[in-house]
Interface confidence: medium
């Protein structure tokens, strides 16, 4: 598909509006600290240049690669060295090293102010005054805070964001209409960002083969009626799309994602009976809908897997002839029969099968050696089942907040070196697995829970990678993608940890806590809980519960007091002293 001008090709394929939006996202994901106005200026310059190339593909510089064009543009930013430090050194490199350098400097936890939501009337005025700038600002703010956000999906979020303002700014009660929609978009956006971050980590840290294996398993569960060759085709195309997006090639990624949605809809008869509604939607909605589509029904007459993968005399021959295709077939066949398993469990089973064949096909009697391979799967299946059962029981007993607290204590004891904000964020998200998945029937619990936990633990891994402080976290994060969750589950209390010095300032609270939202108040309390465990890692559940109950009562009491600040100062000292006594600090 050689085009004289790549930039003209993508401009024509995507249209001006999507082209501009995607270039803005790309630039904001690379230069996360740059002001909005600077990015808009760069995007406009690139767009004007693209238009000259559409008019004449032979015009000067139109034959340059997108990386060259975009990199050259980013390197014109005057304050690059002052703002980004060593990232400026990327500009001394040639493509493709320059783009790789920019990618390496993406920051998963950029030092940016929290996004504060203005009053509804203020937002509606801004929306009406300049709709285009308002929506661009949304793209910019999300993209710079989430440098791996799936760009074509961010266009879909922006479309919904615009629709929410269009509808609600005309409503009688603007706030009642708008705020729930914005909350929903925020929560979905965070989830979408985290899911995509795992895909990029999978590709970048474990390679294309790991991502393809994940995709074979997931698509086989989703499309169990599709033939293996069809699933393979979809996996190949999907891998290309995500490789491009994770590599910063957002125009190509969006273009190829649209092509993939088109292909799926044109061939839905041989893929899935569940695609009909998705395929009637406009492009952005269609792609989103396909990505979220429910699993199709399993074919009724699927034969036993043992015949082809254990009993057949040709197992080692088939394996030797084309290992990855044979293992792909195994994974496809197993996954389409098990929508009740998590993808990571299916990948563990496939890895066990592969290891067994590697060993047995070199043995004197291969069949005798691998005859019992399916028996090895039993403990692998039971481990997540038991874990989910236990944790759902605990969640139902405690409720979400207290379940999060139990996980906070558990994880702080496992990896106390990790920063408190990271432990709070990750444990809160781990705790959300309860309300997200425990309501499901048994058949849906494991894929919901374990695959969600993979996403959350990846957040821990990418945040920890930026400033590594724990060898145990590094080990669990890097050894095996599919065994991350079992690795963390298996960690016991870190006996080598030297407890943190007690600092009364950490446990000093002020009247401003009273005006916080319930969620922010919880985060304050959970931050204190993590700090307590870091000071006293051997504290029992009962001791910690007593201190936290006292703390909750203290906050409630002082927030009702007439002189709140005095109450926090005086009662706070008493609380710290009582807590020290209770914990033996």
């Amino acid at each position: 598909d050689a085009h004289k001008s790549e930039v003209a090709h993508r401009f024509k394929d995507l249209g001006e509006e999507n082209f501009k939006a995607l270039v803005l996202i790309a630039f904001a994901q690379y230069l996360q600290q740059c002001p909005f106005e600077d990015h808009v200026k760069l995007v406009n310059e690139v767009t004007e240049f693209a238009k000259t190339c559409v008019a004449d593909e032979s015009a000067e510089n139109c034959d340059k690669s997108l990386h060259t064009l975009f990199g050259d543009k980013l390197c014109t930013v005057a304050t690059l060295r002052e703002t980004y430090g060593e990232m400026a050194d990327c500009c001394a490199k040639q493509e493709p090293e320059r783009n790789e350098c920019f990618l390496q400097h993406k920051d998963d936890n950029p030092n940016l102010p929290r996004l504060v939501r203005p009053e509804v009337d203020v937002m509606c005025t801004a929306f009406h005054d300049n709709e285009e700038t308002f929506l661009k600002k949304y793209l910019y703010e999300i993209a710079r805070r989430h440098p791996y956000f799936y760009a074509p999906e961010l266009l879909f979020f922006a479309k919904r964001y615009k629709a929410a303002f269009t509808e609600c700014c005309q409503a009688a009660d603007k706030a009642a209409c708008l705020l729930p929609k914005l909350d929903e978009l925020r929560d979905e956006g965070k989830a979408s960002s985290a899911k995509q971050r795992l895909k990029c980590a999978s590709l970048q840290k474990f390679g294309e083969r790991a991502f393809k294996a994940w995709a074979v398993a997931r698509l086989s569960q989703r499309f169990p009626k599709a033939e293996f060759a069809e699933v393979s085709k979809l996996v190949t195309d999907l891998t290309k799309v995500h490789t491009e997006c994770c590599h910063g090639d957002l125009l190509e990624c969006a273009d190829d994602r649209a092509d993939l949605a088109k292909y799926i809809c044109e061939n839905q008869d041989s893929i899935s009976s569940k695609l009909k509604e998705c395929c009637e939607k406009p492009l952005l909605e269609k792609s989103h809908c396909i990505a979220e589509v429910e699993n199709d029904e399993m074919p009724a007459d699927l034969p036993s897997l043992a015949a082809d993968f254990v009993e057949s005399k040709d197992v080692c021959k088939n394996y030797a002839e084309a290992k990855d295709v044979f293992l792909g077939m195994f994974l496809y066949e197993y996954a389409r029969r098990h929508p009740d398993y998590s993808v990571v469990l299916l990948l563990r089973l496939a890895k066990t099968y592969e290891t067994t064949l590697e060993k047995c096909c070199a043995a004197a009697d291969p069949h005798e050696c691998y005859a019992k391979v399916f028996d090895e799967f039993k403990p692998l299946v039971e481990e997540p089942q038991n874990l989910i059962k236990q944790n759902c029981e605990l969640f139902e007993q405690l409720g979400e907040y207290k379940f999060q607290n139990a996980l906070l204590v558990r994880y702080t004891k496992k990896v106390p070196q990790v920063s408190t904000p990271t432990l709070v964020e990750v444990s809160r998200n781990l705790g959300k697995v309860g309300s997200k998945c425990c309501k499901h029937p048994e058949a849906k619990r494991m894929p919901c829970a374990e695959d969600y936990l993979s996403v959350v633990l990846n957040q821990l891994c990418v945040l920890h990678e930026k400033t590594p402080v724990s060898d145990r976290v590094t080990k669990c994060c890097t050894e095996s993608l599919v065994n991350r969750r079992p690795c963390f589950s298996a960690l016991e209390v870190d006996e080598t940890y030297v407890p943190k010095e007690f600092n009364a300032e950490t446990f000093t609270f002020h009247a401003d806590i009273c005006t916080l939202s319930e969620k922010e108040r919880q985060i304050k309390k959970q931050t204190a809980l993590v700090e307590l465990v870091k000071h006293k890692p051997k504290a029992t559940k009962e001791q910690l519960k007593a201190v936290m109950d006292d703390f909750a009562a203290f906050v409630e009491k002082c927030c009702k007091a007439d002189d709140k600040e005095t109450c926090f100062a005086e009662e706070g000292k008493k609380l710290v002293a009582a807590s020290q006594a209770a914990l033996g600090l």
Epitope: A229, S232, Y332
Partner: nanobody, 119 residues
Framework: EVQLLESGGGVVQPGGSLRLSCAAS????????MLWVRQAPGKGLEWVSV????????YYADSVKGRFTISRDNSKNTLYLQMNSLRAEDTALYYC????????????WGQGTLVTVKS
């Protein structure tokens, strides 16, 4: 009735090239993944290469990777196998087949075309 007719086989020296063709009829070729399999004298069936209905992706057995290229022309209902750098161990009866729905079983195949590589 499904028919698959292979042609293009012959005798060739090591290092030489051949192009096999397979004319298909009796089923919707452009919605079927296809493959080439081969059977060397006195040996079992060995699959060689698979091609998806749309032309991509393609897969190759490790023994032929980098030497053989599978392709198709859906407008002509024809499957091809370009074989370069042929070796003595490539000597076999080559069959084209409709890719299995799922299991390691092939739905339909033709009569085969013989490829002999010898100096």
């Amino acid at each position: 009735e499904v028919q698959l007719l292979e042609s293009g086989g012959g005798v060739v020296q090591p290092g030489g090239s051949l192009r096999l063709s397979c004319a298909a009829s009796g089923f919707t070729f452009d919605t079927s993944s296809m493959l080439w399999v081969r059977q060397a004298p006195g040996k079992g069936l060995e699959w060689v290469s698979v091609i998806h209905q749309s032309g991509t992706p393609t897969y190759y057995a490790d023994s032929v990777k980098g030497r053989f290229t599978i392709s198709r022309d859906n407008s002509k209902n024809t499957l091809y196998l370009q074989m370069n750098s042929l070796r003595a161990e490539d000597t076999a009866l080559y069959y084209c087949a409709k890719f299995p729905s799922s299991r390691m079983k092939f739905d339909y195949w033709g009569q085969g075309t013989l490829v002999t590589v010898k100096s």
